[in-house]
């Protein structure tokens, strides 16, 4: 027997859509072989209608697609705008049509239920609103208006003009009688439930002269949209529920056991702990649509997600919803990168950020995730030379090592720097990673003086002490600016005496500035690296003043604070500075970003918080 499995019978009605899932053993060969959907002919052949290699028959043009989910061993055929001509016997299969690797599917498309003559069909999504219009004649204008629902053989009163409301509809139904000019009354039902579906009868008058109108209400539960994303990548759920719920609280939840749908995030400020640091709910548009970005996808993130609107900020019966089935592909193209980087107060961290190597020219960004409200990610630095003012002299984004990785260095760490940071680009929105910076106990490994004052026209020598653990590393001094840190010549002065229990392999490397000018004022970093991979750094601010007495200045470590005082950042520290990553449209489909530095997007960023790898900073 064939190992392919699927639905034996699919039944639907004209105008509807079907989504047919075919299951296959997910062997390496099966995953990559051709998938097809064909129609069986009377003589036994099977004519391909759509295949995974891009073929689409003219019969299916613009209304069908085939998506392969190799990780799950499934492929899905979606067919929209069904007609009775689509009824027939089909096969879904692998390889070539005539081989046995297929499954027979019977598709039957009917006209719909036997509706009474003059029946108006209303097709409405679950949770939305329907307005059933009921015309009547002048002689019934003053008579009772009512709506009944056919339950089995009996009509049951739903609402009438005398004020009766069936308990099943309390709080979500009203009967409107139009102005005298219009011979029409309407029944409006909100927050539609699946159980509301069925045959309705509206009536004006109660005697034999009453006017009657039949209505057939179909309530559609949304088919989950299948979403397939890479482990460690990111996913964006775009949720458009319509303007009628623009002012209602929105939520994204994940279905667990039973009826439960656990809130992942909502606009009332709730967020599931598992998504801390890796989720943003983007502000909604005027039409009530919004989007949720989840980065650093983990295996356990796979499942069924619903977005919806309800005043409680969680799924309730009658919530309008959209649904997705998220699959997480473990054969990910996104490389593993540390999810936690540790540093000590006064020390530094160097964070490696992966990006899609095909997009080496894309603009790189680093932002600080904030959990307040629905989450936001104000930019701190980019690869075009912009650095947030409060980070000047202590933050740098370097294109090195390149080929799919850039580096962010942050030094002069304080406890305020602990938190989640996102690496992203203006290119591939799936390549967003999150790293958590933790500030741990310990002393910085590199020792430099505190602030240093140089004298115009004189020579300044600034020492940097490297412990023996860095004996095999390249040691450097550089001058910080917005675009990076320009290397400067430095002198190895031999072993350092700044470390206890450290042998001859410790080093004192000095920066010498000859004939100091005003242009020499600024931040200088000493640091270590191995090839293009950066390690720890320490920063010194050099101020320049007028000459007081002749001579050169040689700054000793004693004059400095080993760990600089924690800076008290002004209250604007966490403000948006119109650099917050919010607007989902910017990095999404529109790759041409107007001026990304003024409007950058966190709506689609990504992390590997799913891995427990850690990267040390200044101290382990």
């Amino acid at each position: 027997k064939s190992p392919i499995f699927g639905p034996e019978e699919v039944n639907s009605v004209e105008g509807n859509s079907v989504s047919i899932t075919c299951y296959y053993p997910p062997t390496s060969v099966n995953r990559h072989t051709r998938k097809y959907w064909c129609r069986q002919g009377a003589r036994g052949g099977c004519i391909t209608l759509i295949s995974s290699e891009g073929y689409v028959s003219s019969k299916y043009a613009g209304r069908a697609n085939l998506t392969n989910f190799p990780e799950n061993g499934t492929f899905v055929v979606n067919i929209a705008q069904l007609s009775q001509d689509d009824s027939g016997r089909y096969k879904c299969g692998l390889g070539i049509n005539s081989r046995g690797l297929s499954f027979d599917v019977s598709l039957e498309v009917s006209q719909g239920p036997g509706l009474l003559n003059d029946t108006k069909v209303y097709t409405v999504d679950l949770g939305r609103t329907v307005t059933i219009n009921c015309p009547f004649k002048t002689e019934n204008a003053q008579k009772r208006k009512s709506l009944y629902k056919q339950i089995g053989l009996y009509p049951v009163l739903v609402i009438d003009s005398s004020g009766y409301v069936n308990p099943n509809y309390t709080g979500r139904i009203r009967l409107d009688i139009q102005g005298t000019g219009q011979l029409l009354f309407s029944v409006v039902i909100n927050q539609l439930r699946l159980s509301d579906a069925g045959q309705y009868l509206c009536q004006a008058g109660d005697d034999s002269n009453s006017n009657k109108k039949n209505a057939d209400l179909q309530v559609l539960k949304p088919e989950p949209e299948l979403v397939y994303e890479d482990l460690r990548g990111s996913v964006t759920f775009h949720c458009a529920l319509g303007p009628e719920v623009a002012n209602v609280a929105k939520f994204l939840c994940r279905q667990s056991s039973g009826e439960n749908c656990d809130v992942v995030v909502n606009t009332l400020g709730k967020r599931a702990p598992a998504f801390e640091g890796r989720i943003l709910l983007n502000p909604q548009d005027k039409d009530g649509s919004f989007s949720v970005v989840i980065t650093g996808l983990r295996k356990e993130d796979a499942g069924r997600y619903l977005c919806g609107a309800h005043s409680d900020g969680q799924l309730q019966e009658g919530s309008p919803i959209q649904a997705w089935q998220l699959f997480v592909n473990e054969e990910s193209t996104i490389p593993r990168s540390p999810t936690v980087v540790k540093g000590v107060a006064g020390g530094s961290v160097a964070v490696l950020c992966p990006y899609n190597r095909k997009e080496s020219k894309s603009i790189k960004y680093w932002c600080l995730w904030e959990g307040a409200q629905n989450g936001r990610c104000p930019l701190l630095v980019d690869s075009e030379g912009w650095v947030k003012a409060q980070y000047e002299g202590r933050l740098s984004l370097l294109e090195e090592p390149g080929n799919g990785t850039f580096t962010v260095i942050l030094n002069q760490l304080t406890s305020r720097d602990a938190g989640f940071y996102w690496c992203l680009t203006n290119g591939d929105t799936l390549w967003r990673t999150t790293v958590e910076i933790k500030i741990i106990e310990g002393e910085p490994n590199l020792k430099v003086p505190g602030n240093v004052t140089a004298v115009l026209g004189e020579t300044l020598k600034v020492p940097c002490h490297f412990p023996c653990k860095f004996s095999s590393y390249e040691k450097y001094w550089c001058k910080w600016n917005n675009t990076g840190c320009q290397a400067l010549p430095s002198q190895d002065e031999g072993p350092s005496k700044a470390f206890v229990n450290c042998d001859e392999n410790s080093r004192l490397v000095s920066l010498t500035l000859n004939l100091v000018t005003r242009a020499d004022e600024g931040w200088y970093w000493c640091g270590v690296k191995q090839g293009h991979f950066y390690g720890e750094t320490a920063a010194v601010y050099v101020a320049v003043e007028e000459r007081k007495a002749a001579g050169s200045r040689d700054v000793s470590l004693a004059k400095a604070d080993a760990a600089p005082d924690e800076k008290v950042l002004d209250s604007g520290f966490r403000e948006i500075e119109n650099k917050a990553i919010q607007d989902p449209r910017l990095f999404a489909e529109e790759k041409a970003v107007a001026d990304t530095r003024d409007q950058a997007d966190g709506s689609r960023a990504s992390v590997d918080s799913g891995s427990s790898e850690e990267q040390g900073g200044s101290s382990r």
Epitope: P7, R193, L220, K221
Partner: nanobody
């Protein structure tokens, strides 16, 4: 919570027929996948897939069957009664088992019992030769 109650089991001769019913009650608004599984004597805790029905609205539904019951068993539902049926024809002794009704919000694979959220208590079907 959703409750599922099976009925219709019993003793039948080889070649005979039975119709099992599974009535759902409670908060069923998002249950739209129902399946039948069976557990043969001495096979605990293994439950084998028999048939499943998934619907996306009142007008679109999908029926799945295990190879062993194809052509003999039919799954159907009565939406108004919130009930799913399993019509079993041409019964064989190897169909003897406890039959369980299962319900869920959505399944990735109808054959996998873990994908269903609710289960009934089971009804015994015995086919004698």
């Amino acid at each position: 919570e959703v409750q599922l109650v099976e009925s219709g089991g019993g003793l039948v001769q080889t070649g005979g027929s039975l119709r099992l019913s599974c009535a759902a009650s409670g908060r069923t608004f998002s249950s739209y996948a129902m399946g039948w599984f069976r557990q043969a004597p001495g096979k605990e805790p293994e439950r084998d897939f028999v048939a499943a029905l998934r619907w996306s609205n009142d007008r679109t539904y999908y029926k799945y069957y295990a190879d062993s019951v194809k052509g003999r068993f039919t799954i159907s539902r009565d939406n108004a009664k919130n009930t799913v049926y399993l019509q079993m024809n041409t019964l064989k002794p190897e169909d003897t088992a406890v039959y369980y009704c299962a319900g869920g919000n959505y399944f990735s694979d109808p054959r996998v019992d873990k994908e269903y959220n609710y289960w009934g208590q089971g009804t015994q079907v015995t086919v004698s030769s």
